[in-house]
Structure formats: C-alpha cells, structure tokens
Amino acid sequence: VAQVSITKCSSDMNGYCLHGQCIYLVDMSQNYCRCEVGYTGVRCEHFFLTVHQPLSKEYV
C-alpha cells in the first residue's frame, strides 16, 4: 500500500472547506476536505439529511 504524505492546509486555504477539515495531500499536490457528518461535496458545501420515513399503512 502506497503511503500518502499529508499535512494541514496552509492559511492560504482558510475557508476552503465549509463544513470540514482541510487536509493537504502533498504527493497529489491538492487540498482535500474531510467533511463533518451530514455534509458532502468537494468543499463540504452540501448538507444532506437522511430522512427515515415511517412505514406506510399499506405496508403494515
């Protein structure tokens, strides 16, 4: 398994990840956002809510 060198993002990227932690993937020359639970998107900009629907009467 190839090792990936990571570090924190520079201050230059402050605000890049809207709802998550910014990680600098050194060998890949890119920033990556590790999103908080409930958020998705390249920059953790989308909120998604998983709604559990109650069972319908027909099913019961």
Epitope: D12, Q30, N31
Partner: antibody, heavy 116, light 106 residues
Amino acid sequence: QDQLVQSGAEVKKPGASVKVSCKASGFNIKDTYIQWVRQAPGQGLEWMGRIDPLNGNTKYVPKFQGRVTITADTSTNTAYMELSSLRSEDTAVYYCVRSGTLFDFWGQGTLVTVSS
Amino acid sequence: DIQMTQSPSSLSASVGDRVTITCKASQDIHKYIAWYQQKPGQAPRLLIQYTSTLQEGVPSRFSGSGSGTDYTFTISSLQPEDIATYYCLQYDNLRTFGGGTKVEIK
C-alpha cells in the same frame, strides 16, 4: 481534460478599463479558488488577488485595492479580472490560476497593452 | 504581507555545475513554498511544491529544501535545457513571488 482558457489580447488607452475572462472546462470553478497573476515585459511574476467562486469572497494585494475587481460567474464557469484607471505600467500578461483541488493550474495568459 | 527575497537575481554557470538559488521569507512560511521555471514566451511551469515535493515528470536533478524562513532550490547538474528564469512562491498566507533568478550558461 481540465483547461483554463483566457480571452484574447487587448489594447487600451491610459485611463480606460480592461476586463479579462478565464473560462474553465473539465472542472467546476466552485471547487477551487481562482487567482490572478500578472507579468510585465521582462519583469517578474506579481500576485494580484483571488476569488472564491463559491461565495464571491475576494482578497486583493493592497497595491491593487480599489483598481482591481475579481468576479466569477458560476453559471458559465468563468472568472473575470477587471483593472481600471489603466496606465502604461499595467502593460503585462495576465494569468488566471486555479488552486485548491489541484495546485496551481495556469491559463495561457492574456496580453494587455496600455498605449496612447 | 509576507515578502520573499530571492537571490541571486541572475547567475551564469557551466553545463554540469551545481546551481543553488535561495529564498528568504519575512516570516515563517511553514514549508509552504513552491518553485517555478519559466522560459521566454511560456507560462510558468511548477517544478516543486511544499518545499521539496517534485512534480510528476520533473527531472530528479531539481530539488528543494528548507524550513522556517529560509529555503533553497538546487539544480544538481545544470543542463542546456535548464536555461530559464526561476521563481519561488510562498502560499502560506495568500501568495507572494520572489523576484526571480535568471539562469544562463557560461
């Protein structure tokens, strides 16, 4: 493949404004920051500022503050740099540069000539 | 604003020579420095980022080192195709380029 295609060369008179466009393809500019860099003939590289296309937030070098406006249109995946009150010293190649998802991916450059 | 002082502004060396360029930051930039090569009429080409990480396809004769405020870019054995101007760029806090170093063959 990812590309940043800039608008063509411009010739402007002193005191006028210029607006350079930078159209992205192969990626969404909302996933990136778009920086602008310029280079006068025979001179070094000079960072001007940047925009976060996701929210429109901008940062400018104090030297250009008040004279430069960087904008982005996410519907067309295009960023713009407008420089006003042009003077001869603004004659330069202007580059847009993508950063964020990939470290510093450059456009081909746009030559702006300021001459009376 | 962070200032980047690059030296020398120009140098002349023979093919096969070891060439060293330095950049000094006005404050700690936490290794967030990149090095570019620019040939006349071309856009800059990224060689190294995060002090020492060589980009794909860049020859191993190019290297970088440093920490804190002091950084070095080295060409271990100068080749004719290395004739260009080299720039450092700090990206720790916004961005600032060094003044550039023009490398010529003796």
